[in-house]
Interface confidence: low
């Protein structure tokens, strides 16, 4: 079941999924200038078995000064709309990003692809925030948001995460702040 | 290759001031925060100060706000510290160190220059 | 101030030996880090965020802790593990004294 809304989102942070669950899929989108290649997939899809999980399908681009009869593939509107995207340049890449069953790690980049990837998160996925450079976080909480199944409608769990800028607070490796409790989250989880 | 490399060994005398260089690489200077870190002989380390490139801010160990300089040439990708009035107490090595976080945002450094020996000694 | 205190100055350990290192907070914190420098060099990042290996790390070392217990844990140490061990606090930058780790 895909989310049908984005992660929320954190002033100053941007959020990264450490792997992408079955059935999460990544929109084609080729940088300014080229397209993708006539009848070339639209999305890369996270598919697999129990022991093994791969990205379906592949994401090729072409350049658009190149003479070609077809129409030029561009998204449908359903496609264009606010899809969380995740930008591809991250300060480090986890280092315990994959190898959970039923997930796919970071696909490869391909030739001339967009600056920002979009994905289509689906429920149960996990993505993690952190402060961008030059903000630093103030914890309350995990800073972590899951897409859940509630009532039958998706929803996204708020991260507990605050990003502050060393101007506001005269210090980036200031004094540790309190810690709240897991039990003291300001997220509820009670059920129907 | 992200890489910190910095200026070579210096002697001075005490009262003196030395500036020690740090010339980034691999990376886009003005994003990461740069730490000054140093290690007197057979002691362990002693984080001195930060600078952030992208803006020129700055912050302090209390033990060195009053005898040291961050500064940061972001064309020449290189930072500066500066202490002066030098005492034999301050003969150390001297580190610049990267500041990155986790996914979690939580900082640490994640790479380092060589190292520079500053002697102080009459 | 967050001051942290490691414990033992020194561990002197036969290859295949288990290392366990400390590192006390003077008040709680949420996250440590760990760094190995090795005479002469550099320190290297080691563990960071309490219990994550920085790359290139050998799988059998670990860190875990709480509030204000930390422990970076060999499971069998090996020569090249000989070494000088730091933590710090992820948010004041403060070093703790450091453990140094040798190998008979």
């Known amino acids: 079941e895909l989310c049908d809304d984005d992660p929320p989102e954190i002033p100053h942070a941007t959020f990264k999924a450490m792997a992408y669950k079955e059935g999460t899929m990544l929109n084609c989108e080729c940088k300014r200038g080229f397209r993708r290649i006539k009848s070339g997939s639209l999305y890369m899809l996270c598919t697999g078995n129990s022991s093994h999980s791969s990205w379906d399908n592949q994401c090729q681009c072409t350049s658009s000064a190149t003479r070609n009869t077809t129409k030029q593939v561009t998204p449908q509107p359903e496609e264009q709309k606010e899809r969380k995207t995740t930008e591809m340049q991250s300060p480090m890449q986890p280092v315990d990003q994959a190898s959970l069953p039923g997930h796919c790690r970071e696909p490869p980049p391909w030739e001339n692809e967009a600056t920002e990837r979009i994905y289509h998160f689906v429920v149960g996925q996990m993505v993690y925030y952190q402060c961008v450079q030059g903000y630093r976080a103030l914890h309350r909480g995990p800073a972590e948001s899951v897409c859940k199944m509630t009532h039958g409608k998706t929803r996204w769990t708020q991260p507990q995460l605050i990003c502050t800028g060393e101007m506001e607070t005269s210090q980036f490796p200031g004094e540790e702040k309190p810690q709240a409790s897991p039990e003291g989250r300001p997220e509820s989880e009670t059920s129907c | 290759e992200v890489q910190l490399v910095q200026s070579g060994s210096e002697l001075k005398k005490p009262g003196a001031s030395v500036k020690v260089s740090c010339k980034a690489s691999?990376?886009?200077?003005?994003?990461?925060?740069i730490n000054w870190v140093r290690q007197a002989p057979g002691q362990g380390l002693e984080w001195m100060a930060w600078i952030f490139p992208g803006n020129g801010n700055t912050y302090f160990n209390e033990n060195f706000k009053d005898r040291v300089t961050l500064t940061a040439d972001k064309f020449s990708s290189t930072a500066y510290m500066e202490l002066s009035s030098l005492r034999s107490e301050d003969t150390a090595v001297y580190y610049c160190?990267?500041?990155?976080?986790?996914?979690?945002?939580?900082?640490?450094?994640?790479?380092w220059g060589q190292g520079t020996t500053v002697t102080v000694s009459s | 101030e967050i001051v942290l205190s490691q414990s033992p100055a020194t561990l002197s350990l036969s290859p295949g030996e288990r290392a366990t290192l400390s590192c006390r907070a003077s008040?709680?914190?949420?996250?440590i880090h760990w760094y190995q420098q090795k005479p002469g060099s550099s320190p290297k990042p080691w563990i960071y965020?309490?219990?994550n290996l920085a790359s290139g790390v050998p799988g059998r070392f670990s860190g875990s802790g709480s509030g204000t217990s930390y422990s970076l844990t060999v499971s069998r140490v090996e020569a090249e593990d000989a070494a000088t061990y730091y933590c710090?606090?992820?948010?004041?930058?403060?070093f703790g004294g450091g453990t140094k780790v040798e190998i008979k």
């Open positions: 160190a990267r500041a990155t976080y986790d996914h979690g945002g939580y900082w640490y450094f994640d790479v």
């Open positions: 008040s709680s914190v949420s996250h």
């Open positions: 965020a309490t219990s």
């Open positions: 710090q606090h992820w948010n004041s930058f403060t």
């Open positions: 691999g990376y886009t200077f003005t994003d990461y925060y």
